[in-house]
């Protein structure tokens, strides 16, 4: 009998709100592993420092990420 | 709004299961907790499960006896409390996640007392 | 025996200044933020500060919270009768199974 591994996610709660771009100090995605088997997004706010995670299923937040990564491939030369 | 259901006198040993019952929030996003208060004596914290039930955290004081769990569908939260001992009478409160990072309690319910007791 | 260290008492006359002291570590206060609750007499714990120093909304701004290091602390000022109650400190631990921790509670009184 394989022994039951023990799943450690990060994130308790999830957001759904939409999040502007510009409030976000760091936004770091965490894919599935064998400590937890889903995709985890967590932003931090420039605002207080605050964490929060993000609901990567949620519209507003794969919007978010559609806006983030096409603000990066315009920095990057 | 948190209510909280299922305690009562229970014999050393024996079993019971608590209900919280969630209203007024989106239930299905937020991680959940139990936290317990004995009479007379402060706040200690049972137990958590996130938002999809994957993931949860116990105290060393009820690990292995305990078990948290929950039905989005149903918007309620459960702790199923096995071999029971004198020890665990207490208030069972339920509370709902701060919501963000690191977990933290925000809305409590009113509590379930649970008298264990030959 | 509580993982956070709070004074078991604190008092002070209307109007006046009381802090509550909440002694840590760096697996908790340390590394994360504290929340503190107001529990009165015969009623559930009610959250009063989040994230060190966040006030929800409907508390006083007389409560105001902090952190520095492995301690916080909770100032009341212009203590009122109604604030006659027990408070707690907590934080998320980063010990290897991850939990909230306490402290012992601290009973204010209102002389």
């Known amino acids: 009998v394989p022994l039951s591994r023990t799943v450690r996610c990060t994130c308790i709660s999830i957001s759904n709100q939409p999040v502007n771009p510009r409030s976000l100090e760091k936004l770091e995605i965490i894919p599935a592993s064998q400590f937890c088997p889903r995709v985890e997004i967590i932003a931090t706010m420039k605002k207080k420092g605050e964490k929060r995670c993000l609901n990567p299923e949620s519209k507003a937040i794969k919007n978010l990420l559609k806006a983030v990564s096409k603000e990066r491939s315009k920095r990057s030369p | 709004q948190l209510v909280e259901s299922g305690g009562g006198v229970v014999q050393p040993g024996r079993s019971l299961r608590l209900s919280c019952a969630a209203s007024?929030?989106?239930?299905?996003?937020?991680?959940m907790h139990w936290v317990r208060q004995a009479p007379g004596k402060g706040l200690e914290w049972v137990a958590v499960?996130?938002?999809?039930?994957?993931?949860?955290y116990y105290a060393d004081s009820v690990k292995g006896r305990f078990t948290i769990s929950r039905d989005n569908s149903m918007k309620t939260l459960y702790l199923q409390m096995n071999s029971l001992r004198t020890e665990d009478t207490a208030v069972y409160y339920c509370a709902k996640d701060l919501g963000d990072l690191p977990p933290g309690l925000d809305y409590w319910g009113q509590g379930t007392m649970v008298t264990v007791s030959s | 025996q509580s993982v956070l260290t709070q004074p078991p008492s604190a008092s002070g006359t209307p109007g006046q200044r009381v802090t509550i002291s909440c002694s840590g570590s760096?697996?908790?206060?340390?590394?994360?933020?504290v929340n503190w609750y107001q529990q009165l007499p015969g009623a559930a714990p009610k959250l009063l500060i989040y994230t060190n120093n966040q006030r929800p909304s409907g508390v006083p701004d007389r409560f105001s919270g902090s952190k520095s290091g492995t301690s916080a602390s909770l100032a009341i000022s212009g203590l009122q009768s109604e604030d006659e109650a027990d408070y707690y400190c907590?934080?998320?631990?980063?010990?290897?199974?991850?939990?909230?921790?306490f402290g012992g509670g601290t009973k204010v009184t209102v002389l």
């Open positions: 499960i996130s938002y999809d039930g994957g993931t949860k």
């Open positions: 760096s697996s908790n206060i340390g590394s994360n933020t």
């Open positions: 007024g929030f989106t239930f299905s996003t937020y991680g």
């Open positions: 907590a934080a998320w631990d980063d010990s290897l199974n991850g939990n909230v921790v």
